[in-house]
Amino acid sequence: MMTGTIETTGNISAEKGGSIILQCHLSSTTAQVTQVNWEQQDQLLAICNADLGWHISPSFKDRVAPGPGLGLTLQSLTVNDTGEYFCIYHTYPDGTYTGRIFLEVLESSVAEHGARFQIP
């Protein structure tokens, strides 16, 4: 039975040209995290494998940085980065947990940043 829950930063906004940290946290389960995928719609941004570490998709290599923790930092944001982002936790023995974050990239310099979630 899957008992875990994913906490995310929820809906966040950031300024064009700036950067943002996408964070998810899996709690309420003792399942072992084997891999975390970060995806934007159907595009793979990055993967953190428990054994082998981070792989950043070549198309995002210059704009994505791993961390902090299992989170992901998006840099040099453009309006086209607006949309849904998913953290997909692959765990054993539970299976897969998915969290959703909506990012809005604003042209304005008064972008309201959502609270940045930190892994304890």
């Epitope: 891999q35 793979l44 993967i47 054994d51 082998l52 570490g53 981070w54 792989h55």
Partner: antibody
């Protein structure tokens, strides 16, 4: 041409130290994981350890048989990989290979890891 | 750590024959992290197969790989004189990376 060339092997006494080098050319060194693999005379292949790439902060990991005695490092500005071997034992006698580790994910989200480029090897003999 | 057991230890065959090499893991491994290498005397290993079944660049199609879970197979459909060598399987996840003990394919 993608190439790896090891050097630094030789004869050393038990308890001694040796530093192996691996010069890489023909590819973007900083993007790749790099592994050391050894082969004792007449035996099979044994993984020694690896250093991850820049994205992974050059994290290093080692086989249990060498942990605490061997240290892997790299200098991306020189496209070079190193293996510092201390407290050498007779059972460390082997040909040492450096190899390029390919770590990536396909469009199917399947992960891959394999060693696609190997050096010619350098011989380390530990004997009194 | 995962132990990879290769069998047979030695395979004696004639050119033109089919070679079937086995690699068995002590526990389940992801097929995408399973590779096969060929090594000839005095030479470095050469990558043949990765992801259990994908041929590396420049590898002839007489080499094929298959399997999943704990059982993997390397098949050489028709042995050529240059195929007589030692073959190793390797897995990378879970850590640490391990190799099988090798199978020597020799001329009968």
């Amino acid at each position: 041409e993608v190439q790896l060339v090891e050097s630094g092997g030789g004869l050393v006494q038990p308890g001694g130290s040796l530093r192996l080098s691996c010069a890489a050319s023909g590819f973007t060194f900083t993007d790749y994981y790099m592994d050391w693999v050894r082969q004792a005379p007449g035996k099979g292949l044994e993984w020694v350890g690896r250093t991850r790439n820049k994205v992974n902060s050059y994290y290093t990991e080692y086989a249990a048989s060498v942990k605490g005695r061997f240290t892997i490092s790299r200098d991306d500005s020189k496209n070079s990989l190193y293996l510092q071997m201390n407290s050498l034992k007779t059972e460390d006698t082997a040909v040492y290979y450096c190899a390029r580790g390919q770590y990536y994910y396909g469009s199917d989200r399947r992960g891959y890891y394999y060693m696609d480029v190997w050096g010619q090897g350098t011989t380390v003999t530990v004997s009194s | 750590e995962i132990v990879l057991t290769q069998s047979p230890g030695t395979l004696s065959l004639s050119p033109g024959e089919r070679a079937t090499l086995s690699c068995r893991a002590s526990q389940s491994v992801s097929s995408s992290y399973l590779a096969w290498y060929q090594q000839k005397p005095g030479q470095a290993p050469r990558l043949l197969i990765y992801g259990a079944s994908s041929r590396a660049t420049g590898i002839p199609d007489r080499f094929s790989g298959s399997g999943s879970g704990t059982d993997f197979t390397l098949t050489i459909s028709r042995l050529e004189p240059e195929d007589f060598a030692v073959y190793y399987c390797q897995q990378a996840v879970p850590s640490p990376l391990t190799f099988g003990g090798g199978t020597k394919v020799e001329i009968k």
